[in-house]
């Protein structure tokens, strides 16, 4: 059903990293425009991206209101220049997205090793606590603020001169690892939410090696 030459959106896909959340869909419009609605299970639909020719809509502002809720979005198609027109049943064509629960599904962004400090045979490695777009009391929360102990970091480290990797884990943003004195090490970090069934791990942070500018060394 639907107005002639108006087609329903398809391939609705959530793209979300650290709660920055965009809905994408197809097709590129020809003589039509789109409006997006989003709702939790309450059915209180909120319209966004009115009469757009884009095939994406930033829904971050809506999902950060409660990242533990499950959201559904729907994309309505209207004839360009005649947005009051509806389908043959008196309803505009629309398609639903998959369900999306940000807390369970947003991708974990690539972490950054903020600093490392060697004291004797110990190295303290700190992973940057990235800011998200989730707010509380007018302040942006960090990834750790949002996920708490659900979020761990894994550190992979190795002697610069070899390839055999060791691992360490922390449920804070800091590692304290044992190293050999006078030996240079390289490392990268990965964010992990072990309780998840999808999107459990981030991509790896950039590799950092001792002797580079982020490091500090004390005997």
């Amino acid at each position: 059903s639907g107005t002639t030459n108006t087609v329903a959106a398809y391939n609705l896909t959530w793209k979300s990293t650290n709660f920055k959340t965009i809905l994408e869909w197809e097709p590129k419009p020809v003589n039509q425009v789109y409006t997006v609605q989003i709702s939790t299970k309450s059915g209180d639909w909120k319209s966004k991206c009115f009469y757009t020719t884009d095939t994406e809509c930033d829904l971050t502002d809506e999902i950060v209101k409660d990242v533990k809720q499950t959201y559904l979005a729907r994309v309505f198609s209207y004839p360009a220049g005649n947005v009051e027109s509806t389908g043959s049943a008196g309803e505009p064509l629309y398609e639903n997205s998959p369900e999306f629960t940000p807390y369970l599904e947003t991708n974990l962004g690539q972490p950054t090793i903020q600093s490392f400090e060697q004291v004797g045979t110990k190295v303290n490695v700190t992973v940057e606590d990235e800011r998200t777009l989730v707010r509380r009391n007018n302040t942006f929360l960090s990834l750790r603020d949002v996920f708490g102990k659900d979020l761990i970091y894994t550190l992979y480290y190795w002697k610069s001169s070899s390839s055999g990797k060791k691992t360490a884990k922390t449920n804070t943003n800091e590692f304290l690892i044992d190293v050999e004195k006078g030996v240079s090490y390289c490392f990268f970090a990965q964010a992990v939410i072990p309780s998840r069934t999808v999107n459990r791990k981030s991509t790896d942070s950039p590799v950092e090696c001792m002797g580079q500018e982020k490091g500090e060394f004390r005997e």
């Epitope: 709702s39 309450s42 209180d44 639903n96």
Partner: antibody
Framework: EVQLLESGGGLVQPGGSLRLSCAAS????????MSWVRQAPGKGLEWVSS????????YYTDSVKGRFTISRDNSKNTLYLQMNSLRAEDTAVYYC???????????WGQGTLVTVSS | DIQMTQSPPSLSASAGDRVTITCRAS??????LAWYQQKPEKAPKSLIY???SLQSGVPSRFSGSGSGTDFTLTISSLQPEDFATYYC?????????FGQGTKLEIK
């Protein structure tokens, strides 16, 4: 466990009124749209009305528009259906149901019988 | 209003049988369709939503398929507790409408 318990049904004369209630428990009531569905004796299911979690959006089947009013009190976890100007054809078991996104009906009450007869 | 037509209206089968019930919408509803099971004197129970998504707690012998106007509910191996009446429902647009039901009886 989700529980929905309807009450308020009974025998009423044509032209009369009844208010049905549905007490909800086991979930965050305000987070869900809710619906009323009815079933006349020996017949199939008929969707009657739906309301969004905030109560801001309400929807009705044509045959009850202007006669029935759906409402909710989120502080009491209760859904209502005010039925006025009742007709014989409104005789049915009325079910309250939870309705994610105001779409399908994932949990149902046990129903309450409304009989409209003189 | 969108009309929902189920077939067959009634069906006799035996435990262990594979059973298919169909539902046809009078116009395209994408995959906005649900299936319910109702036993005598009981409230309906949700089985399937979004045409093919299994409701939590429903046995995997139940499955749904279809999109647009034609949909099916399949029970892969009938169990004694599956004898009941089955309804489809569209939630594409208001007023939401149900099929007239398919009564599944023991042969």
């Amino acid at each position: 466990e989700v529980q929905l318990l309807e009450s308020g049904g009974g025998l009423v004369q044509p032209g009369g009124s009844l208010r049905l209630s549905c007490a909800a428990s086991g979930f965050t009531f305000s987070n869900y749209a809710m619906s009323w569905v009815r079933q006349a004796p020996g017949k199939g299911l008929e969707w009657v009305s739906s309301i969004s979690g905030s109560g801001d959006y309400t929807y009705y089947t044509d045959s009850v528009k202007g006669r029935f009013t759906i409402s909710r009190d989120n502080s009491k976890n209760t859904l209502y259906l005010q039925m006025n100007s009742l007709r014989a054809e409104d005789t049915a078991v009325y079910y309250c149901a939870r309705s994610p996104w105001g779409y399908y009906l994932d949990s149902w009450g046990q129903g309450t019988l409304v009989t409209v007869s003189s | 209003d969108i009309q929902m037509t189920q077939s067959p209206p009634s069906l006799s089968a035996s435990a262990g049988d594979r059973v298919t019930i169909t539902c046809r919408a009078s116009q395209g509803i994408s995959s906005r369709l649900a299936w319910y099971q109702q036993k005598p004197e009981k409230a309906p129970k949700s089985l399937i939503y979004a045409a093919s998504s299994l409701q939590s707690g429903v046995p995997s012998r139940f499955s749904g398929s279809g999109s647009g106007t034609d949909f099916t509910l399949t029970i892969s191996s009938l169990q004694p507790e599956d004898f009941a009446t089955y309804y489809c429902q569209q939630y594409n647009s208001y007023p939401y409408t149900f099929g007239q039901g398919t009564k599944l009886e023991i042969k």
